[in-house]
């Protein structure tokens, strides 16, 4: 059974008194929470590229604008990791790259980027509307994803614009670090604005998520932030994707995450604020996710020293650092 | 201590096939891929594929994606590898190898090898 | 897919002799994310299975004697044995473990006059 998680929605502040002392009083939280919330957010971003030499030949390049060292980054086509998505590349800083065909050559670029060509014949191979997503775990931010595809009407050479994600989803790691820090204190903030002027403060409505199912798959955008952001998953053509593959689909291990309401990473506008969300560049959507699931008392994917927060899609000791077990 | 134990040798047929057992022990048998290697004689090492033991999904090496078949039994921690429509070829010994510890592919454990001759 | 290419393909030394092997890659092997060489070296000895060496260029496996040195960044390396020793004669391959498929080089067999 899956669980639609609602986007936490902002509640309008309450009838205020009127004059520029109730506006004041109205404007400060909303600009305190404002700030509270897009602060530090990181983003991916994701560009997909058709080689003028083998027209169906890709290069998928990602990268992540955020602070935090990366421990894991999962390609794959056809929708999210997860959520209907295959496996193309994992790459781990430590422990190497593993990739399953179409994929020919994962790379890191830099620190923070990484590159893979796509094989351009065969029975798996990609064509131009397919959707590639890229997922960085990183710490303390935690896990955060973005997905794009070449625009409609691409010349082979061309390349859509890097789509920015201006909100993706935080994993455990994160909400626990920086982001549940920053939350705190926006939450402490409101409430002694509150206290101190008597007056209701806007509200985050909590998520609507069913507490009977939580294994609901926390890579499946729900329904809310589809119909906000006019996520395309439902055009995505899978007549490219492979019908048989004998390669990996590393999706094992449950889903362990625990459930915890997520911060809005845009600039909060009253109610309609994620109906009014800028869209990214054509060619290109952004996987939105605002629920962490887990199983209580659930054993991880896999377990032993040196494990870190993070579950790795292709299962075993994905997330293990170099000093594992002798 | 880690240990992968391999089946004994085989003497096959051209266009039979072969499936040719590893078993693990000494360490947690579905945290790491199980690698395949072949070793043709007085040859360098060709890497086949690999088996993630806990949910059985594969990876192949090109080259031998219609050739070898990569299964594993969790309940006994023992991976298999078959051969088939096996030819001169396919004469080799073949090596079940652990994945390392610190990198996916710097196989830390190999099984003693397989000796596989097809002759008619 | 990643070419290894070793040399020489045979060298015999004497014992207590210092021994230096090749290999190339066709493509570096250097990790930009954390500057880490993604080469290892086996020594197979006749009649038995790899053995790991050297993992990352130069980091040594446990066990492993410490006159086995690794080296080399981007697409060379070296494997140098500082003082040879009988118990040495194999053969020895270098192998990228940075992606997807694992690819060994030809080897380099040591013999011991």
């Known amino acids: 059974m899956r669980t639609e998680a609602q986007v936490p929605a902002l509640q309008p502040p309450e009838p205020g008194l009127e004059g520029a002392m109730g506006h004041r009083t109205l404007v400060l939280p909303w600009v305190l929470l404002t700030l509270c919330v897009t602060a530090g957010t990181p983003e991916v971003w994701v560009q997909v590229r058709m080689e003028a030499t083998e027209l169906s030949s890709f290069t998928i390049r990602c990268g992540f604008l955020g602070s935090g060292s990366i421990s894991l980054v999962t390609v794959s086509w056809g929708g999210p990791n997860g959520a209907g998505g295959t496996t193309l590349a994992v790459l781990h800083p430590e422990r190497g790259i593993r990739q399953w065909a179409p994929a020919r050559q994962a790379r890191w670029e830099t620190q923070s980027s990484i590159s893979l060509i796509l094989e351009g014949s065969g029975a798996s191979s990609p064509c131009a509307n397919t959707t590639f997503c890229c997922k960085f775990a990183s710490f303390p931010e935690g896990s955060w994803e973005a997905c794009g595809s070449l625009p409609p009407s691409s010349d082979p050479g061309l390349s859509a614009p890097p789509t920015p994600a201006p909100i993706l989803r935080a994993d455990l790691a994160g909400i626990l670090g920086v982001s549940g820090v920053l939350l705190f204190g926006c939450v402490y903030l409101l409430h002694l604005l509150r206290r101190h002027k008597h007056r209701p403060a806007p509200r985050l409505q909590p998520s609507r998520t069913s507490p009977q199912a939580p294994r609901a798959r926390a890579w499946a955008p729900s329904q809310a932030s589809q119909a906000a952001l006019h996520v395309p998953y439902a055009t995505i053509n899978t007549s490219c994707r492979p019908a048989t593959l004998d390669t990996a689909h590393p999706h094992g291990g449950p889903s362990w995450w625990a459930s915890l309401p997520t911060h809005a990473a845009h600039r909060p506008q009253g109610p309609a604020a994620w109906a009014s969300t800028p869209i990214p560049a054509r060619g290109s959507f952004v996987s939105v996710e605002n629920g962490l699931y887990a199983q209580a008392g659930e054993r991880p994917p896999h377990t032993g020293p040196g494990l870190t927060l993070f579950p790795d899609p292709r299962g075993p000791r994905a997330m293990e650092g170099p000093l594992g077990v002798r | 201590e880690v240990q992968l134990q391999q089946s004994g040798p085989e003497l096959v047929k051209p266009g039979a096939s072969v499936k040719i057992s590893c078993k693990a022990s000494?360490?947690?048998?579905?945290?790491?891929?199980m690698n395949w290697v072949k070793q043709s004689h007085g040859k360098s090492l060709e890497w086949i594929g690999e088996?993630?033991?806990?949910?059985?999904?594969?990876n192949y090496s090109q080259k031998f994606r219609d050739k070898a078949t990569l299964t594993v039994d969790k309940s006994s921690n023992i991976a298999f590898m078959e051969l088939r429509s096996l030819t001169s070829e396919d004469s080799a010994v073949y090596f079940c190898?652990?994945?390392?510890?610190?990198?996916?592919?710097?196989?830390?454990?190999w099984g003693q090898g397989t000796s596989v001759t097809v002759s008619s | 897919d990643i070419v290894m290419t070793q040399s020489p393909s045979s060298l015999a030394m004497s014992v207590g002799q210092k021994v230096t092997m090749s290999c190339k890659s066709s493509?570096?092997?250097?990790?930009?994310?954390?500057?880490?060489?993604?080469l290892a070296w086996y020594q197979q000895k006749p009649g038995q299975s790899p053995k790991l060496l050297v993992y990352?260029?130069?980091t040594r496996e446990s066990g492993v004697p410490d006159r086995f040195i690794g080296g080399g960044s981007g697409t060379d390396f070296t494997l140098t044995i500082s003082n040879v020793q009988p118990e040495d004669l194999a053969d020895y391959f270098c192998?990228?473990?940075?992606?997807?498929?694992?690819?060994f080089g030809g080897g380099t067999k040591l013999e011991i006059k």
């Open positions: 190898a652990k994945e390392g510890v610190s990198s996916y592919y710097a196989m830390d454990y």
């Open positions: 000494g360490y947690m048998f579905t945290d790491y891929y």
């Open positions: 088996i993630n033991p806990n949910n059985g999904d594969t």
């Open positions: 493509q570096s092997l250097l990790n930009s994310n954390n500057q880490k060489n993604f």
């Open positions: 990352f260029a130069s």
């Open positions: 192998q990228q473990h940075y992606s997807t498929p694992p690819t």
